[in-house]
């Protein structure tokens, strides 16, 4: 079936950087773009960016625009997402999600990775 | 940047109807999209463009979508139905916005 | 929504040549923007496209006489050293959907006509 | 490389009869096929996208199937109005392409 598997929970202190992996199966992997998508906790749902699995095009949410970098592997079927400068505030939990091709719904999301920055 | 406004929160009794809101400017001329979240869990979409529901969500949800407020409506509420409930839009200055969320009690 | 090349004339061979594709009612960072064109009496010839960042993708016959830019509001296409075979309509095109990565197109301009003469 | 052969290139059929047009890419490009109608003198419009979706406004006699490396469109019940030339147009790859196109199918209508 079509799923997403993440990487990890992290720790990170802040200034660093993180690097959270989302592997896709169970579908064409370039059918699709790919979202990512943030929760601090007990907060709502925020949008940080698109990524054109096959042209490698992203859009960003304009909050992260200096310091998010979002890529794809097409020979893994694999999307990355990478934020610098970490901040406490950036403790969340980040989700990818497959974005239908045609509309602008997430129809199947990946169970998420905490990343705690902390000192 | 357009925004979404929702209620913080729904209290519905079991087996009756639970009308979730979601506003925003003109939302009616865009298509909105809501997702069900269960605490510890990531997100599903039960509704897309509007009133159409994804394969495996019971004909109890519905949506409508008109001037300025859309809904979801869960009728004959089940206590799995708890949860955070998110609306969403694509605008073409803000890109993809989300709702604040509504979470809803099945008393 | 809409597109509008400008810049199509009559050229001599070696003379490069700007084509300008003006875009209102949406935004080039959301969308990405191809070029085609067609020589008068035969079929669509793909050139390449820009995406939402700005990387440009050509067709391989196309690779190094053509270059694609573009500001907040234009596409451009420039031809660095044009021949009689280049003669045709140019058509700017944008994709149906934000960041759809060149899949298809909705919208085209009226194009604009390309005569390389000596 | 991703390169579109379109068959046939030139078809004639009556009113009301049913036309099937071929497109076939060099390789797979899974669903990423559309369709375009021109007539002369004017920019291709949209008929198909994702082999099989209907764009806006477009009739249901025109149908699209296939995936992978076989498409068809199908034009039923001819109209005077559908007398143009179709377009195929892979939109999976630009990494190594000759041309996204097919090399078009003129119909005439009878």
């Known amino acids: 079936q079509v799923q997403l598997v993440q990487s990890g929970s992290e720790l990170k202190k802040p200034g660093a950087s993180v690097k959270v992996s989302c592997k896709a199966s169970g579908y064409t992997f370039t059918q699709n773009n790919m979202d990512w998508v943030r929760q601090a906790p007990g907060q709502g749902l925020e949008w940080m960016g698109d990524i054109n699995t096959r042209s490698g095009g992203v859009i960003y949410n304009e909050e992260f625009q200096d310091r998010l970098i979002m890529t794809v592997d097409k020979s893994t079927d694999t999307a990355y997402m990478e934020l610098s400068s970490l901040r406490s505030e950036d403790t969340a939990t980040y989700h990818c999600a497959r974005r239908k091709s045609y509309g602008y719904y997430l129809d199947v999301w990946g169970e998420g990775t905490l990343v705690t920055v902390s000192s | 940047s357009y925004v979404l406004t929702q209620p913080v929160s729904v209290s519905v009794a079991l087996g009756q109807t639970a009308t979730i809101t979601c506003e925003g400017e003109q939302i009616g001329s865009k298509e909105v999209h809501w997702y069900h979240q269960r605490p510890g869990q990531a997100p599903i979409l039960v509704m897309f463009r509007d009133a159409r529901r994804p394969s495996g969500i019971p004909e109890r949800l519905s949506g409508s979508n008109s001037g300025n407020t859309a809904s979801l409506t869960i009728s004959g509420a089940e206590a799995g139905d708890e949860g955070d409930y998110y609306c969403q839009v694509w605008d073409s200055s803000s890109y993809t916005v989300f709702g604040g969320g509504t979470k809803v009690t099945v008393v | 929504q809409s597109v509008e090349e400008s810049g199509g004339r009559l050229v001599t061979p070696g003379t490069p040549l700007t084509l300008t594709c003006t875009v209102s009612?949406?935004?080039?960072?959301?969308?990405?923007m191809s070029w085609v064109r067609q020589a008068p009496g035969k079929g669509l010839e793909y050139i390449g496209y820009i995406t939402v960042n700005g990387v440009t993708y050509y067709a391989n016959w196309a690779k190094g006489r053509f270059t694609i830019s573009k500001t907040s509001t234009t596409v451009d296409l420039k031809i660095s050293s044009p021949t009689t075979e280049d003669t045709a309509t140019y058509f700017c095109?944008?994709?149906?959907?934000?960041?759809?990565?060149?899949?298809?197109?909705?919208?085209w301009g009226p194009g604009t006509l390309v005569t390389v003469s000596s | 490389a991703y390169d579109m052969t379109q068959t046939p290139s030139f078809v004639e059929a009556a009113v009301g009869g049913t036309v099937t047009i071929k497109c076939q890419a060099s390789e797979s490009i899974s669903s990423w096929l559309s369709w375009y109608q021109q007539k002369p003198g004017q920019p291709p419009k949209l008929l198909i996208y994702?082999?099989?979706t209907l764009a806006s406004g477009v009739s249901s006699r025109f149908k699209g199937s296939g995936s992978g490396t076989q498409f068809t469109l199908t034009i039923s019940d001819l109209e005077c109005a559908d007398a143009a030339t179709y377009y195929c147009q892979q939109g999976y790859s630009y990494g190594d392409v000759d041309n996204a196109f097919g090399g078009g199918t003129e119909v005439v209508v009878k």
């Open positions: 994702q082999a099989s």
């Open positions: 009612g949406f935004s080039l960072s959301s969308y990405d």
């Open positions: 095109a944008r994709d149906q959907y934000i960041n759809n990565g060149g899949a298809e197109f909705n919208i």
